[in-house]
C-alpha cells in the first residue's frame, strides 16, 4: 500500500470520527437540554404543589373561621327567638299597629274575611298620624284599597268594624255617598283619599292588628 | 291647575246618536266620581249619569237604556254615549269630576265648559 493512500485513509478515518464526535456532541446537549427541561418541570411542578397546598391551607382556616361564625350566628339566632318581633314577616309596623298591604283584589267581605284569617281585621284610622302614615304608605301607588268602614244605606252613620263612628274631623268621605247598593257602601282609600262605592266591586286592601311591644 | 276638556256635542236627529267625551288634565292625586250633568233651556242643572271610582254607575231615570257612561281610568277620561235620542235631551251638557289635588285641600269638585247638544229635526 502506497503512502498515499494510506494518507487517504486517515483523512477519511478523521472525518469519520469529527462526525461521529459531533453526533455525540449533539446527542449529549440533546440529552442535557432534555434534562434541563424535565428540571424545570419538576420544579414548576413543584411550585406548583406549594401554592395548591398553601391555599388549601388558607381555604381550610377561612371554612373554620366560617363555621365559628356559624355557630355564633345559630346561637345569636335561638337568643333572638326568644324575642318577639312587634310585626309578622312582611308586615309594616306603625306606631301601635301592623300593615298588611293585600297582594289581591277582592269585594269588601272577601277582603274582610282575608283579614280575619289572618288575626287582623280591615284598616282602621283612629287618627290624623295614622292618616298620614297610610297616605305616606300608598303614595306611590294609584291602587283603591278597601278599609274598614262601611255602611248599610245614606241614611246610616259610617261605622268601622268595631262598630265604632267614622270621627269626622279625620277626613270626608266622597264618591258614592248618596247611593244604595245591596251590599251596603263601602269606603276605599285611593292616594290618600277616601271613595265610598258598592261594598261588592273589587279592590285590594289593608289589613291591620296591633303590634306585638310586650317586652321579654 | 286642573281642566276638563269636553268634545262631541252637536246637531242631531231625534232617534239618532252622539258620543260625548271628556277628559281630565292638569295635576291631581286621585279621581273619584266622573260624569255628567246637562242644563236644558230655562232649566236647573241635572243628573245625567255619573261612574265611580271601582266602575259602579248611576243614570237618571230619563236616560236609562239609552245612556251609556263608561270611563278610561288610566287615561283620566269619561265617556258618554247618547243613543235614541229625543228633542228634550236638548241641553248644555257638562262634565264632571272629583278631584283630589291635595288631601288637605278644600276644592274638589271641577266642571267643563259645557258642550251644546240639540235633538231636532
Known amino acids: 500500500m502506497q503512502l498515499s493512500q494510506v494518507s487517504d485513509l486517515l483523512t477519511q478515518e478523521q472525518a469519520n470520527l469529527t462526525h461521529q464526535k459531533k453526533k455525540l456532541e449533539g446527542q449529549i446537549s440533546a440529552r442535557q437540554q432534555a434534562e434541563e427541561a424535565s428540571q424545570e418541570s419538576e420544579n414548576e411542578l413543584k411550585e406548583m404543589i406549594e401554592t395548591l397546598a398553601r391555599k388549601l391551607n388558607e381555604k381550610s382556616k377561612e371554612q373554620m373561621e366560617l363555621h365559628h361564625q356559624n355557630l355564633n350566628l345559630q346561637e345569636t339566632l335561638k337568643r333572638v327567638a326568644n324575642c318577639s318581633a312587634p310585626c309578622p314577616q312582611d308586615w309594616i309596623w306603625h306606631g301601635e299597629n301592623c300593615y298588611l298591604f293585600s297582594s289581591g283584589s277582592f269585594n269588601w267581605e272577601k277582603s274582610q274575611e282575608k283579614c280575619l284569617s289572618l288575626d287582623a281585621k280591615l284598616l282602621k284610622i283612629n287618627s290624623t298620624a295614622d292618616l298620614d302614615f297610610i297616605q305616606q304608605a300608598i303614595s306611590y301607588s294609584s291602587f283603591p284599597f278597601w278599609m274598614g268602614l262601611s255602611r248599610r244605606n245614606p241614611s246610616y252613620p259610617w261605622l268601622w268594624e268595631d262598630g265604632s263612628p267614622l270621627m269626622p274631623h279625620l277626613f270626608r268621605v266622597r264618591g258614592a255617598v248618596s247611593q244604595t247598593y245591596p251590599s251596603g257602601t263601602c269606603a276605599y282609600i285611593q292616594r290618600g283619599a277616601v271613595y265610598a262605592e258598592n261594598c261588592i266591586l273589587a279592590a285590594f286592601s289593608i289589613c291591620q292588628k296591633k303590634a306585638n311591644l310586650r317586652a321579654q | 291647575e286642573v281642566q276638563l276638556v269636553e268634545s262631541g256635542g252637536g246637531l242631531v236627529q231625534p232617534g239618532g246618536s252622539l258620543r260625548l267625551s271628556c277628559a281630565a288634565y292638569?295635576?291631581?292625586?286621585?279621581?273619584?266620581?266622573m260624569g255628567w250633568y246637562r242644563q236644558p233651556p230655562g232649566n236647573q242643572r241635572e243628573l245625567v249619569a255619573v261612574?265611580?271610582?271601582?266602575?259602579?254607575?248611576n243614570y237618571a231615570e230619563s236616560v236609562k237604556g239609552r245612556f251609556t257612561i263608561s270611563r278610561d281610568n288610566a287615561k283620566n277620561t269619561v265617556s258618554l254615549q247618547m243613543n235614541s235620542l229625543k228633542p228634550e235631551d236638548t241641553a248644555v251638557y257638562y262634565c264632571?269630576?272629583?278631584?283630589?289635588?291635595?288631601?288637605?285641600?278644600?276644592?274638589?269638585?271641577?266642571w267643563g265648559q259645557g258642550t251644546q247638544v240639540t235633538v231636532s229635526s
Open positions: 261612574t265611580y271610582g271601582l266602575g259602579s254607575t
Open positions: 292638569g295635576s291631581f292625586f286621585s279621581i273619584g266620581t
Open positions: 264632571y269630576a272629583e278631584i283630589d289635588t291635595d288631601p288637605r285641600s278644600g276644592e274638589w269638585d271641577y
